[in-house]
Each structure stands twice: as structure tokens, then as C-alpha cells.
């Protein structure tokens, strides 16, 4: 076909110059020579479809899929991956070829799959298909479960796409609030994938394999409960299933429930109702709103209305990519030696994050607690009053977040001294960082009150030990003080400490340590 453009598909493998966990470079820096992926016309396909050779990528590797188009005039394009459209900005190279690139940083299982590139040129439209898979180092995973409606039944199936295939259990609770904690007697667990009893107060599905346990709660609006002060919000990514349950109890059966999205009734096939009588003969109705695979236009206010209850709403937000929203500015804290204190990070994220707290190259478990306003909080209290730098790191499928904290412990200086043939040095790690004085002890000054100002060199931050600053002061030896005892004193707002040194000795000779409060 004369009109078809000349197309070249290439793979560029990048050498990440930082492969450390928890760091993400904005763009891989060093790249190897491009590998030609062929891009042959696909036979018997409707429309013009080019297919690139399959791409196998190592876990955590960074690559660029690139298409070079030799066609006259401007081109416009669109990438589609897993039903999501992704931004596409073509540019032109020195040979005036159109260049379209897709960068995949730190390859993960979630980024494996088919990448479709739709290109529109002045002459014709065509599609290019890339298939990207992870090289065969099997990755066991544990993914958050999701719900599906059971075919031809009013029941929910719980699915977790994990390996090894997880043990799935439903966690049900019929009481309110605190009594629905995991080990409470009010909690019932059912080790099965299908749940028929959907009237409970709190319904969660959990999946566990040797990597741990992940749970998903069935998002519920209860019309008999007082609405939250802030509107409940539910985040989903394009392509994920949406499930919202509306529940209402009334003295008799004479009431109905309806779902609306932005004041328009949900289409049939996007909801189903169930009802039952409770033990006290009141009627319980539940109405599910569900979308098997959400798109951007499913975003909005979902309102459940009843003929006998005030209506309530939830805001459903569909996002292209996951996110972690939090302030990443570093924070410094100053506490007393026995003061109770916890670091905390408040964030909003979807999908749920995994996080770690790190101090002195050691990682600590990270717990998250959901707040009523849609935010979550992670606290770290296990610092054991050790000063230094603490790092909070969070990741989900699509985003990474790091926040630094510095902890300073207010305490009186502790002084260590050492001497060489030419100088004497004193070190202290008190906080606030101490100031220094040097004094000479002589016949004229037996109490060591004669201050030395010549030859003193103070360094405020000599070395940083995991974020803990150490201050030092050095006295260069002169003939005037050789053979004498000298005293170095470090003082801050909490007190003073001193060390006495004999200056003619070649080695360290701490004579007396004075602790003057």
C-alpha cells in the first residue's frame, strides 16, 4: 500500500544509575543502543495494525518503547494500556521522523501487558501493538481482593489475583464500631470465596498467602446511621470494579431504595436489591451499585435514596493512576530525654500504600490507621530517644513518597578528649549543640580559670552519625601551654561538662572529668 508510512519500532534498555529500593529517578540516565523490534503489519486484522516483537523485561528494569514514523506532515497519537488512555507527545528527530516514546520506569508486574499506540497522520490512521512481559523470575505476590457478582445469584465472589493462590475468607461483623475489631467475639470468619449473607453491618474479604494478609471492605452507606461530617470518598483506578452497598432498616416492607449518579438513575444491570426480615420482624433492604470495570465517566456523587429515610451520598473518584498525597517537607523535632513523642505522617493514597520507617539503616514495621476524613495516618514511636534522621517511605503500584524527620534530644553535653603531640581535641554530642571554652591550669590559676583564646578551632558539626551532629573543639599546642594541664568545657542550656588534659603526654590523658550542671 503506497499510503502506508515507514514505521520503525525500537526498545531502549536503560541502565538505572540508582537501583536502590525506595528511590525513583525521574528518568533513567544511561541507555544502551536501541534494539529493533521489527514492527510487521499484522495479517487479517481489521484496520492497519503493526505488531512489534514481544518484549521481555527484568523486574525493576527501565525501558523505553519507541516508534519512529516516516510520514509527511504532523501526527497525533494516543497510548492505551489496560483500557486507560495515556498521554502521548510526539516530537520530530533530525531526519524529520515523528518520534513517539513510552517510558516504563522500574518494571513491575502491574506494568506488564499490551501497549497500544494509535497514530493519526495526515494520510492515514494506524495502530501499533507492543507486548511487554516480565522475564521469568516468578514473583509471588499478594494483591488486595476485589468483589464480583456471582452469575445468576445474589451473592458476592471475592477474588485476589495472587500467587500462591491465597486462602480467601470473609470477615463479618454485626455490631458497631470498636466491637468489630479483628479478634472481637462479634466477628465471624468464613473461609470461602462466595458470600450469600450480605446484610451484615461490616463485611470484609481477606486473602492471605505466605506474603501476608490483605483485606478489602465492602463500601457501605447505612441510611439508619447519622452521616459522617465529611462526605465519604471512594477512589478507584480505571478498569477496577466498583461496589457500593446501600443498607436501610424499617419497621415494615413499605419502602424502596434507589441509586442515582449525579441525579440520574443508575442503568439497569448496574444495581441489584436484596431484602430480608430481621429477628425483630423489621425489614432490611440492601441495594448494590456496581460497575464491573470503571471508566472516567463513572466519577461523581452516588446518592442512595429511600422513601422512608434521608438520602446519603458518597463521592466516587476514578483516577488514571494511583497517588500518594502528603507533604514531603522535612521536619525537625527537639524533645527532652524522657518526653513521650511519636513521628506521624498524614496522607491520602490510592491504592493502599505499603510503608516502612527507617533509622540508622534499620527498617521498622509501619502501621496505618484510617481517619474519618479519608486520610490515613502512620505513627512511629519506637525511636527509643535516639537522636538522628528518621525516614518514612511509602509506595503503591503507581507512586512513591519519602519524608525525612530529624530528632534532636535535649541533653547536657558529654565530653570526650584526646591529645596528640601537637594538639588536644574535645568532642561532644549534647543538644542544643554546645559552645566551647578552654582554660589553663597553673600556679597562678589552680582552679583553671585562665581562659585560652589563642589556637582554638571549633567545628560545629564534625561528623554526622545517622543524622546526629557531633561538635568538636581543637586546641593547637603552643610553647606557652606545653606541660600544663588544660581544661575543655562544653556548655549548652542544659549544663556544662569538662575534661582535663595534660599537654606534654603523647597519648590521650583525660585527668578528671568534671560535670558541672
Amino acid at each position: 500500500n503506497q499510503d502506508l508510512p515507514v514505521i520503525k519500532c525500537v526498545l531502549i534498555n536503560h541502565k538505572n544509575n540508582d537501583s536502590s529500593v525506595g528511590k525513583s529517578s525521574s528518568y533513567p540516565m544511561v541507555s544502551e543502543s536501541p534494539e529493533d523490534l521489527g514492527c510487521a503489519l499484522r495479517p487479517q486484522s481489521s484496520g492497519t495494525v503493526y505488531e512489534a516483537a514481544a518484549v521481555e523485561v527484568d523486574v525493576s528494569a527501565s525501558i523505553t518503547l519507541q516508534v519512529l514514523v516516516d510520514a509527511p506532515g504532523n501526527i497525533s497519537c494516543l497510548w492505551v494500556f489496560k483500557h486507560s488512555s495515556l498521554n502521548c507527545q510526539p516530537h520530530f528527530d533530525l531526519q524529520n521522523r515523528g518520534v513517539v516514546s513510552m517510558v516504563i520506569l522500574k518494571m513491575t508486574e502491574t506494568q506488564a501487558g499490551e501497549y497500544l499506540l494509535f497514530i493519526q497522520s495526515e494520510a492515514t490512521n494506524y495502530t501499533i501493538l507492543f507486548t511487554v512481559s516480565i522475564r521469568n523470575t516468578l514473583l509471588y505476590t499478594l494483591r488486595r481482593p476485589y468483589f464480583r457478582k456471582m452469575e445468576n445469584q445474589d451473592a458476592l465472589v471475592c477474588i485476589s489475583e495472587s500467587v500462591p493462590e491465597p486462602i480467601v475468607e470473609w470477615v463479618l461483623c454485626d455490631s458497631q464500631g470498636e466491637s468489630c475489631k479483628e479478634e472481637s467475639p462479634a466477628v465471624v470468619k468464613k473461609e470461602e470465596k462466595v458470600l450469600h449473607e450480605l446484610f451484615g453491618t461490616d463485611i470484609r474479604c481477606c486473602a492471605r498467602n505466605e506474603l501476608g494478609r490483605e483485606c478489602t471492605r465492602l463500601f457501605t452507606i447505612d441510611l439508619n446511621q447519622t452521616p459522617q461530617t465529611t462526605l465519604p470518598q471512594l477512589f478507584l483506578k480505571v478498569g477496577e470494579p466498583l461496589w457500593i452497598r446501600c443498607k436501610a432498616v424499617h419497621v415494615n416492607h413499605g419502602f424502596g431504595l434507589t441509586w442515582e449518579l449525579e441525579n440520574k438513575a443508575l442503568e439497569e444491570g448496574n444495581y441489584f436489591e436484596m431484602s430480608t426480615y430481621s429477628t425483630n420482624r423489621t425489614m432490611i433492604r440492601i441495594l448494590f451499585a456496581f460497575v464491573s470495570s470503571v471508566a472516567r465517566n463513572d466519577t461523581g456523587y452516588y446518592t442512595c435514596s429511600s422513601s422512608k429515610h434521608p438520602s446519603q451520598s458518597a463521592l466516587v473518584t476514578i483516577v488514571e493512576k494511583g497517588f500518594i498525597n502528603a507533604t514531603n517537607s522535612s521536619e525537625d523535632y527537639e524533645i527532652d530525654q524522657y518526653e513521650e513523642f511519636c513521628f506521624s505522617v498524614r496522607f491520602k493514597a490510592y491504592p493502599q500504600i505499603r510503608c516502612t520507617w527507617t533509622f540508622s539503616r534499620k527498617s521498622f514495621p509501619c502501621e496505618q490507621k484510617g481517619l474519618d476524613n479519608g486520610y490515613s495516618i502512620s505513627k512511629f514511636c519506637n525511636h527509643k530517644h535516639q537522636p538522628g534522621e528518621y525516614i518514612f517511605h511509602a509506595e503503591n503500584d503507581d507512586a512513591q513518597f519519602t519524608k525525612m524527620f530529624t530528632l534532636n534530644i535535649r541533653r547536657k553535653p558529654q565530653v570526650l578528649a584526646e591529645a596528640s603531640a601537637s594538639q588536644a581535641s574535645c568532642f561532644s554530642d549534647g543538644y542544643p549543640l554546645p559552645s566551647w571554652t578552654w582554660k589553663k591550669c597553673s600556679d597562678k590559676s589552680p582552679n583553671c580559670t585562665e581562659e585560652i583564646t589563642e589556637g582554638v578551632w571549633n567545628r560545629k558539626a564534625n561528623r554526622k552519625v545517622f543524622g546526629q551532629w557531633v561538635s568538636s573543639s581543637t586546641l593547637n599546642m603552643s610553647e606557652a601551654i606545653k606541660g600544663f594541664l588544660v581544661k575543655c568545657c562544653a556548655y549548652n542550656s542544659l549544663g556544662t561538662s569538662c575534661e582535663t588534659i595534660l599537654l606534654n603526654s603523647p597519648g590521650p590523658f583525660p585527668f578528671i572529668q568534671d560535670n558541672i550542671s
Epitope: 529500593v21 513491575t108 500462591p164 501476608g212 500504600i353 503500584d397 512513591q400
Partner: antibody
Framework: QVQLVESGGGVVQPGRSLRLSCAAS????????MHWVRQAPGKGLEWVAV????????FYADSVKGRFTISRDNSKNTLYLQMNSLRAEDTAVYYC??????????????????????WGQGTTVTVSS | DIQMTQSPSSLSASVGDRVTITCRAS??????LNWYQQKPGKAPKLLIY???SLQSGVPSRFSGSGSGTEFTLTISSLQPEDFATYYC?????????FGGGTKVEIK
């Protein structure tokens, strides 16, 4: 070098208990899932149990569920198998084996899994009256 | 539980022969299958992981193939040190299950 050494085997009467240990060295023990596998005399291999890298999750073969408990002490680099209510059919050589290595890839926790790639030499358990 | 059926249960072969052992899973296990070699009185040794990936240090005469339910271990040219029992293992779901084993003997 990477090594696993089992101990604690012996002759025990039916209904009694025994505790096996597996000492690990040469690798970061706390980053790996760990398994117990057994082999009855003249028979094939039978998987017994697995424990996650942090000890929070365990899974068992139906034949030992409720009687055996797998556990670990990461501070001592040691894996354990507590065997209660022992039966004649539990007579076997018991091996410990290293499983997957923990990783976190973009928020998804996972194991890189190359199979049970390191095995101990085995310890013999004989259940007999 | 997933059943792993290994065949043959034993075979006789000569040095230099090409040997093929198969393993069939009762349901799909994707590529979550390993092959092990065991000699009398010794612990098993991993040969192949992920159905077809050769474990480092294992001679290239060993190869694995298959996915889903049908898997094959091939020894392209049998060597004297290859006479042993071979097991497959599925680790797609709990409980993990081994095949019954294939004993490769000298003809």
C-alpha cells in the same frame, strides 16, 4: 557459604512430641520464606509446611494440620517444627528448605521465587512403640 | 488440592540417551513448577525453576518446558552422574504438591 543444618530428630513413641530445628547461615534468613519437606523411607517427597519471612503466616499440608506448628526466630536465624501427637506415618527424614526472597516492587510486596533452592541434609524422625 | 502425576515412575536408559520425564497437573498452575534431582541418602537438588529456567550451576543438558498443566524435563544426553530420582513440584497453590517421582536407572 549458604547452609541449612537440621537437628532434633530421634525415636519417639506415638502420641508424643518432638521439636526439630534448622540453623541457617550464609544468607539473610529474615528475608526468606522457609519450608519443611519430609520423605518417608522408600517413598517420595511430601511438602509439610511453609512460614513467611516475618513469621506472620504459616500454611500446612492436610496430613499435619492441627498437629504440627512451624515457627522461626529471625534473631537466631533458626527455623522450627513442633510436632505433637506423632503417628507412625510421620516417620520420615525431615528437610528444611529455603523459599522465596522478599521484595517490594512499587508497593506490591512479593517474593522472587527460584524454588526451594537450598536444602539441609535432613534429620530422621522415627515414630515407633 | 492440585495432584501432580509424574510419568514414567521409572525408566532404564544408557549414557548418551535423550531422556524425557513428564508431569501433569490436575489444574492449571501457570509456570509455577520446579524440577528436583535426588540421589540416595542425599537432599534434593533444584534443577529447573519456573518450568523452564535453569538453576545456576546446573548443566545445560537439563531443560524444562511447558505451562498450564503439561510439563516436561529433558536430559539431552544422559551422563553417569544423572542416574537418580527426579521430582516435579507445583507451588501455584497450597498445599504445595510433589509428583510421585521418576527413577532413572542404568540399562
Amino acid at each position: 557459604q549458604v547452609q541449612l543444618v537440621e537437628s532434633g530428630g530421634g525415636v519417639v513413641q506415638p502420641g508424643r512430641s518432638l521439636r526439630l530445628s534448622c540453623a541457617a547461615s550464609g544468607f539473610t534468613f529474615s528475608s526468606y520464606g522457609m519450608h519443611w519437606v519430609r520423605q518417608a523411607p522408600g517413598k517420595g517427597l511430601e511438602w509439610v509446611a511453609v512460614i513467611s519471612y516475618d513469621g506472620s503466616n504459616e500454611f500446612y499440608a492436610d496430613s499435619v494440620k492441627g498437629r504440627f506448628t512451624i515457627s522461626r526466630d529471625n534473631s537466631k536465624n533458626t527455623l522450627y517444627l513442633q510436632m505433637n501427637s506423632l503417628r507412625a506415618e510421620d516417620t520420615a527424614v525431615y528437610y528444611c528448605a529455603r523459599g522465596g526472597e522478599i521484595t517490594m516492587v512499587r508497593g506490591v510486596i512479593g517474593y522472587y521465587y527460584y524454588g526451594m533452592d537450598v536444602w539441609g541434609q535432613g534429620t530422621t524422625v522415627t515414630v515407633s512403640s | 488440592d492440585i495432584q501432580m502425576t509424574q510419568s514414567p515412575s521409572s525408566l532404564s536408559a544408557s549414557v548418551g540417551d535423550r531422556v524425557t520425564i513428564t508431569c501433569r497437573a490436575s489444574q492449571s498452575i501457570s509456570s509455577y513448577l520446579n524440577w528436583y534431582q535426588q540421589k540416595p541418602g542425599k537432599a534434593p537438588k533444584l534443577l529447573i525453576y519456573a518450568a523452564s529456567s535453569l538453576q545456576s550451576g546446573v548443566p545445560s543438558r537439563f531443560s524444562g518446558s511447558g505451562s498450564g498443566t503439561e510439563f516436561t524435563l529433558t536430559i539431552s544426553s544422559l551422563q553417569p552422574e544423572d542416574f537418580a530420582t527426579y521430582y516435579c513440584l507445583q507451588h501455584n497453590s497450597y498445599p504445595l504438591t510433589f509428583g510421585g517421582g521418576t527413577k532413572v536407572e542404568i540399562k
